[in-house]
Interface confidence: medium
């Protein structure tokens, strides 16, 4: 595994509509979205992480649109905007301006934004605080993940992509150690030779000395 994408785990609580259910991929790490959007440090504090198998990951849950006509009710039912609304109003939280944006999907907000409490309007996510990486009907952006203490940030959270975290140098995470970064092995057993260095996604690789380590490795 390249370690850049997490395996699917329990989805966060999300809103759904007849346009399809949208859920983040890679495990629930966000709080229940509300109609208020996210503001300031409180959103960062909400960026907790649920346990579950997660190899070295691009911390971003990917939004998947399931083409199922199922209503997901989590406390409140989504008010569906008529599909004829091909143009939506976009409220920019960060600079307080409004702009109109054409939306080919009609009632869905574009990546980097979420559904406003005002029908037909979308709010921009705040850089470094929240994100959405697909067209969506969420009432709040997904909170950016904070890298764990044994990880370092590979790329920062943007409005359309979650933080990418990886194990710190000298440690790795793979399918067998999904929850934590493990120390890289110091060397190979007797009779074997190292053919690949440790990476954030894999331990060193050893082959038998007699195998010929310049070929097919």
């Amino acid at each position: 595994a390249s370690g850049t994408e997490a395996a699917a785990a329990t989805p966060s609580k999300v809103w759904g509509s007849s346009a399809g259910r949208i859920e983040p991929r890679g495990g629930g790490r966000g709080a229940l979205p509300t109609s208020m959007g996210q503001h300031g440090p409180s959103a960062r504090a909400r960026a907790g992480r649920a346990p579950g198998p997660r190899p070295a990951r691009e911390a971003s849950p990917r939004l998947r649109v399931h083409k199922t006509f199922k209503f997901v009710v989590v406390g409140v039912l989504l008010q569906v905007v008529p599909s004829s609304a091909a143009t939506i109003k976009l409220h920019d939280q960060s600079i307080g301006t409004q702009q109109w944006e054409h939306s080919p999907l009609g009632e869905l907000c574009p990546p980097g934004s979420h559904r406003s409490e005002h029908p037909g309007a979308c709010n921009r996510c705040t850089e470094g605080v929240g994100y959405t990486n697909a067209s969506n009907n969420l009432f709040a952006c997904l909170p950016c993940t904070a890298c764990k203490s044994d990880e370092e940030e590979r790329s920062p959270c943007t409005t359309t992509r979650n933080t990418a975290c990886q194990c710190k140098p000298g440690t790795f995470r793979n399918d067998n150690s999904a929850e934590m970064c493990r120390k890289c092995s110091r060397g190979c057993p007797r009779g074997m030779v190292k053919v690949k260095d440790c990476t954030p996604w894999s331990d060193i690789e050893c082959v038998h000395k007699e195998s010929g380590n310049g070929h097919n490795i």
Epitope: R190, V193, K209, E210, S211, G212, N213, G214, H215, N216
Partner: antibody, heavy 119, light 109 residues
Framework: QVTLKESGPGILQPSQTLSLTCSFS??????????VSWIRQPSGKGLEWLAH???????RYNPSLKSRLKISKDTSSNQVFLKITSVDTADTATYYC???????????WGQGTTLTVSS | QAVVTQESALTTSPGETVTLTCRSS?????????ANWVQEKPDHLFTGLIG???NRAPGVPARFSGSLIGDKAALTITGAQTEDEAIYFC?????????FGGGTKLTVL
């Protein structure tokens, strides 16, 4: 261009110690994956592997002859040595040194040095 | 110590495909035996053909290939040529040492 060349005494008497030298060029024994083996061939017969030394000074020996063999190397002078103690007539053979390279095979061979053990 | 057995002699014709095999007295040959194949031509000219069961070294013609067939290691020459007439030795690795077979004399008529 990889070359290997063996040298030895030619003739020994039983119970003496055989000292063989393999001088090579075209590769370095400090390179990971490299190694040199000693192999012998009695006249008209098959091959018998004797010993191997790796780039990291790890060594392997033929179990049947282990107590009599000692392999060593001088990386800086590109030489590998083999000592066989207490020789007898059964050790009469042509002795080859061969490189084991990165493809895991005995790829380059010397032309051999002949030993006759005779009283 | 294990014994490695090869056909003592085989004959083939130019252009034909011929397979030489290498059997171990200690059971099936596996990739952990890192089967090697060495060619000996007249005047004690040795060339390593195959290492690690199927790794063909640079410079070795593509008609030579190594594999495992059943419980044996095999060297296949696809489209034998007259210059392939030689003695072929296989060698198997047993945990910490090599054992050579007795060699197969291949005649290309």
């Amino acid at each position: 261009q990889v070359t290997l060349k063996e040298s030895g005494p030619g003739i020994l008497q039983p119970s003496q110690t055989l000292s063989l030298t393999c001088s090579f060029s075209g590769f370095s024994l400090s390179t990971s994956g490299m190694g040199v083996s000693w192999i012998r061939q009695p006249s008209g017969k098959g091959l018998e592997w004797l010993a191997h030394i790796y780039w990291d000074d790890d060594k392997r020996y033929n179990p049947s002859l282990k107590s009599r063999l000692k392999i060593s190397k001088d990386t800086s002078s590109n030489q590998v040595f083999l000592k066989i103690t207490s020789v007898d007539t059964a050790d009469t053979a042509t002795y080859y040194c061969t490189r084991r390279g990165e493809y895991g095979n005995f790829d380059y061979w010397g032309q051999g040095t002949t030993l006759t053990v005779s009283s | 110590q294990a014994v490695v057995t090869q056909e003592s002699a085989l004959t083939t014709s130019p252009g034909e495909t011929v397979t030489l095999t290498c059997r171990s007295s200690s059971g099936a040959v596996t990739t952990s035996n890192f089967a090697n194949w060495v060619q000996e031509k007249p005047d004690h000219l040795f060339t390593g053909l195959i290492g690690g069961t199927n790794n063909r070294a640079p410079g070795v013609p593509a008609r030579f290939s190594g594999s495992l067939i059943g419980d044996k290691a095999a060297l296949t020459i696809t489209g034998a040529q007259t210059e392939d007439e030689a003695i072929y030795f296989c060698a198997l690795w047993y945990s910490n040492h090599w054992v050579f077979g007795g060699g197969t004399k291949l005649t290309v008529l």
